[in-house]
C-alpha cells in the first residue's frame, strides 16, 4: 500500500532511506533536455521474493532534441522538488553489501537522470534524518519516521529531531562523519 | 484523503470539441501518472492514454492516438481528455485512474458521461 | 492491441467457488508479473482488487485470489457471496509500455 503523504518536514533537515521496502517506485526523472524514451519504462519497481529483491525496469533518457512532438522537456530540477524526493546518490558511492530482506537497496544512477529523485514509499517504509551542513542535532529523540497504516488511512510517525545552527554536521544513526562528504551525506547504504 | 475528481457529464453534438477533466487531490498529484480509460455503454473497459503531470509526457493506445489529446496543468494536479471533433460514436462513460505501484491503476474517478448525438 | 481474452459470464451459487481466466500473449501478460484484476459494480468505476498477479491491496478480501501461467491469468473467488456479483476485468502492462484490458466477465450469483 502506498503512503499518501510525504515524511514530515524538519526544519533544516533531510531524511532519506537505508533500504527501500517491496512495492517501492522511483519515478524514471530526466534532466532538463532530456526524457524517457518513448517505449521505456515509467517508473523503477523494488520487487522480489523473500530471499532476494531488485529493482525492475531500467530508467532509460534520451535528448529531446530527437522529439518530434511539441510536448513539453522535463522541468528544471528545482520544479521536481515537491514530494517524496531525495538526494540521487553519487555513482561513486560504495555500497555496503549486507542483506536487509524484503528491500531494495539505492538503485544506481542511470544516464542522463534528474538531481532530484521522486520516490513513491509504502507503507513499513522507515526514512531517516539529519541535520543539513551547518546545522546540528539539539534534544535529540528518534531521528527516524514509519508509514504506518491507521485505520485504513497511512501516516508517517513524527521524528524528535531539532537541528540548531552550528556549523557542525550530524550523521544518520550509528555513522562516524565521512571525512570526503562535504554534504554530509552517508558513506555506505543497507542493501538487500 | 486521495481522490481524483471528474468533471461533470457533457451532452455534445458531432463535430463539436470537448475538454473533459480529472483533479488528483489527497496525494502528490504531480509525481504519479493518470491514465484514460474509456466504456462504451454496455461494453467494457478500453485503456486510452497516460500522462505524468510532473513534465507531461503522454502515452497513447495505438487505437486512440490522433484521435484524442490528454494533456495535464500541474499547478492545478489536473489531467484532460480533448477532443476536437466528436462523432456518435465518442459516446461513453471516461474514467481517470492514478497509476500506482505494480503498474495498476489504484484509484478512479467517478467518471465522466460523455453523449454526442445529433 | 487486441483485448485480453476474458470469458464472457459465469455463475455460480452462493459458498461456491468460480475461477475467471484472461489469456494475453508473450508481449503482454506472459512479459511481466503486471497483470491486474478489477471489479466493476452495476453503475459504479472499477476497484482495483489484485495487482502483481496476485496481491491485494488492503480492504480486498482474501476470498480473492490470482495466478499466473504463461501467458494466461487467473482470478479466483472463494466463497462467493451474493455481493460478488459484478463485471471482472483483467489488465495487463505491455511491452511497448502500455495497458491492455480484458473484455470483461459478467458473474452472477444463482439464487
Known amino acids: 500500500e502506498l503512503c499518501d503523504d510525504d515524511p514530515p518536514e524538519i526544519p533544516h533537515a533531510t531524511f532519506k532511506a537505508m533500504a527501500y521496502k517491496e512495492g517501492t517506485m522511483l519515478n524514471c526523472e530526466c534532466k532538463r533536455g532530456f526524457r524517457r524514451i518513448k517505449s521505456g519504462s515509467l517508473y523503477m519497481l523494488c520487487t522480489g521474493n523473500s530471499s532476494h529483491s531488485s529493482w525492475d525496469n531500467q530508467c532509460q533518457c534520451t535528448s529531446s532534441a530527437t522529439r518530434n512532438t511539441t510536448k513539453q522537456v522535463t522541468p528544471q530540477p528545482e520544479e521536481q522538488k515537491e514530494r517524496k524526493t531525495t538526494e540521487m546518490q553519487s555513482p561513486m558511492q560504495p555500497v555496503d553489501q549486507a542483506s536487509l530482506p524484503g528491500h531494495c537497496r539505492e538503485p544506481p544512477p542511470w544516464e542522463n537522470e534528474a538531481t532530484e529523485r521522486i520516490y513513491h514509499f509504502v507503507v513499513g517504509q522507515m526514512v531517516y534524518y539529519q541535520c543539513v551542513q551547518g546545522y546540528r542535532a539539539l534534544h535529540r529523540g528518534p531521528a527516524e519516521s514509519v508509514c504506518k497504516m491507521t485505520h485504513g488511512k497511512t501516516r508517517w510517525t513524527q521524528p524528535q529531531l531539532i537541528c540548531t545552527g552550528e556549523m557542525e554536521t550530524s550523521q544518520f544513526p550509528g555513522e562516524e562523519k565521512p571525512q570526503a562528504s562535504p554534504e554530509g551525506r552517508p558513506e555506505s547504504e543497507t542493501s538487500c | 484523503q486521495v481522490q481524483l475528481v471528474q468533471s461533470g457529464a457533457e451532452v455534445k453534438k458531432p463535430g463539436e470539441s470537448l475538454k473533459i477533466s480529472c483533479k488528483g487531490s489527497?496525494?502528490?498529484?504531480?509525481?504519479?501518472?493518470i491514465g484514460w480509460v474509456r466504456q462504451m455503454p454496455g461494453k467494457g473497459l478500453e485503456w486510452m492514454g497516460i500522462?505524468?503531470?510532473?513534465?507531461?509526457?503522454?502515452r497513447y493506445s495505438p487505437s486512440f492516438q490522433g484521435q484524442v489529446t490528454i494533456s495535464a496543468d500541474k499547478s492545478i494536479s489536473t489531467a484532460y481528455l480533448q477532443w476536437s471533433s466528436l462523432k456518435a460514436s465518442d459516446t461513453a462513460m471516461y474514467y481517470c485512474?492514478?497509476?500506482?505501484?505494480?503498474?495498476?491503476?489504484?484509484?478512479w474517478g467517478r467518471g465522466t458521461m460523455v453523449t454526442v448525438s445529433s | 492491441q487486441s483485448a485480453l481474452t476474458q470469458p464472457a459470464s459465469v455463475s455460480a451459487s452462493p459458498g461456491q467457488s468460480i475461477t475467471i481466466s484472461c489469456t494475453g500473449t508473450s508481449s503482454d501478460v506472459g512479459a511481466y508479473i503486471y497483470v491486474s484484476w478489477y471489479q466493476q459494480l452495476s453503475g459504479k468505476p472499477p476497484k482495483l482488487i489484485l495487482y502483481?498477479?496476485?496481491k491485494r491491496p488492503s480492504g480486498i478480501s482474501d476470498r480473492f485470489s490470482g495466478s499466473k501461467s504463461g501467458n494466461t491469468a487467473s482470478l479466483t473467488i472463494s466463497g462467493l457471496q451474493a455481493d460478488d456479483e459484478a463485471d471482472y476485468y483483467c489488465?495487463?502492462?505491455?511491452?511497448?509500455?502500455?495497458?491492455?484490458f480484458g473484455g470483461g466477465t459478467q458473474l452472477t450469483v444463482l439464487g
Open positions: 502483481d498477479v496476485s
Open positions: 485512474a492514478r497509476l500506482g505501484s505494480a503498474y495498476a491503476f489504484d484509484i
Open positions: 489527497g496525494y502528490s498529484s504531480t509525481s504519479y501518472w
Open positions: 500522462i505524468y503531470p510532473g513534465d507531461s509526457d503522454t
Open positions: 489488465s495487463s502492462y505491455t511491452r511497448s509500455s502500455t495497458w491492455v
